[in-house]
């Protein structure tokens, strides 16, 4: 069965930005990626970013920077800056839509010992499944 | 079927605002952006800005900043740009897209005129 | 911002012949991530909305002739007609996606000779 991991860093350098890693363990192609902070999307949670393989990427602050890492893993740097920016225990949410698998979504935070620069390895979080 | 519809064409006097208005409908309104774009009479595209509706989140051409304003009503699924300060320049049709610009409405002619 | 610009401005093409477009982008529209290009290419015609034709510089969008086929990568992208219909008259633009803000080229007007 297909998986989604999750992985959550704070920056060494700046305290208050964070890099979430996300990928797809499965065999389907992706069609779309969204990336979403404060819970589920769709269920409370603020899309931060949404990625597509070929039309493009659209984001929204505090996401600085979203990009494709490998064809089945993205990448999205939060500015942490203001009232919107991320706290330690904040929980951040990728769902991969994925034929003929489905959509598939996880979710994770940081690690409550990590000292900043440091993360846990990228193990699949709690899976979620939701049809397309 | 996805459709985008705007509203009708309008006449402002310089100084003036307009809300230009566009109806989503076949597709899950709040998950993507809705994009406007303007198109002076004879020129080419130009991207104003972004709002997603599920949170209101903006993206602006640092050239429209203070120009126009994205709203969205996911109630109603609708997306609205106010344009302000109007001027002759501000003359154009403006387009509202959706899903990386892969739907358009019919454009909204906006002339401003004294 | 990404500049992109067109050639020709405008071109002239028989029935039946083909019809090449270009773009050139000031910076690289390659995802190295995913190997893929992000730049896109629409039609217009009067009084219309444009109408996307092709993503990721080669994918064609559901519904768009075969003979509609693009092309690139980097910072060179083509949009090629292979055989001209009268349909295909219209203005022709090319587009950065890869990064905020989302540039049009200048536009090609196509017409037939």
């Known amino acids: 069965t297909p998986e989604v991991w999750v992985q959550v860093r704070m920056e060494a350098t700046e305290l208050s930005s964070f890099t979430i890693r996300c990928g797809f363990l499965g065999s389907g192609s992706i069609s779309l990626v969204t990336v979403s902070w404060g819970g589920p999307n769709g269920a409370g949670g603020t899309t931060l970013a949404v990625l597509h393989p070929e039309r493009g990427i659209r984001q929204w602050a505090p996401a600085r920077q979203a990009r494709w890492e490998t064809q089945s893993s993205i990448s999205l740097i939060l500015e942490g800056s203001g009232a919107s920016s991320p706290c330690a225990n904040t929980t951040f949410c990728c769902k991969f839509a994925s034929f003929p698998e489905g959509s598939w979504e996880a979710c994770g935070s940081l690690p409550p010992s990590s000292d900043p620069g440091l993360s846990a390895p990228p193990t699949p979080a709690p899976i979620l499944r939701a049809d397309l | 079927e996805v459709q985008l519809v705007q509203s009708g064409a309008e006449v402002k006097k310089p100084g003036s605002s307009v809300k230009v208005s566009c109806k989503a409908s076949?597709?899950?309104?709040?998950?993507?952006?809705i994009e406007w774009v303007r198109q002076a009479p004879g020129q080419g595209l130009e991207w104003i800005g972004e709002i997603l509706p599920g949170s209101n989140s903006t993206n602006y051409n640092e050239k429209f900043k203070g120009k126009a304003t994205f709203t969205a009503d996911t109630s109603t699924n609708t997306a609205y740009m106010e344009l302000s300060s109007l001027r002759s320049e501000d003359t154009a049709v403006y387009y509202c897209?959706?899903?990386?610009?892969?739907?358009w409405g019919q454009g909204t002619l906006v002339t401003v005129s004294s | 911002d990404i500049v992109m610009t067109q050639s020709p401005d405008s071109l002239a093409v028989s029935l039946g012949e083909r019809a090449t477009i270009n773009c050139k982008s000031s910076?690289?529209?390659?995802?190295?991530?995913?190997?893929?290009?992000?730049l896109a290419w629409y039609q217009q015609k009067p009084g219309q909305p444009p109408k996307l034709l092709i993503y990721g510089a080669s994918t064609r969008e559901s519904g768009v002739p075969d003979r509609f086929s693009g092309s690139g990568s980097g910072t060179d992208f083509t949009l090629t007609i292979s055989s001209l219909q009268a349909e295909d008259v219209a203005v022709y633009y090319c587009?950065?996606?890869?990064?905020?803000?989302?540039?049009f080229g200048q536009g090609t007007k196509l017409e037939i000779k």
């Open positions: 076949g597709y899950t309104f709040s998950s993507f952006s």
């Open positions: 587009q950065n996606a890869h990064s905020y803000p989302p540039t």
């Open positions: 897209s959706s899903y990386w610009f892969a739907y």
């Open positions: 910076q690289s529209l390659l995802n190295s991530g995913n190997q893929k290009n992000y």
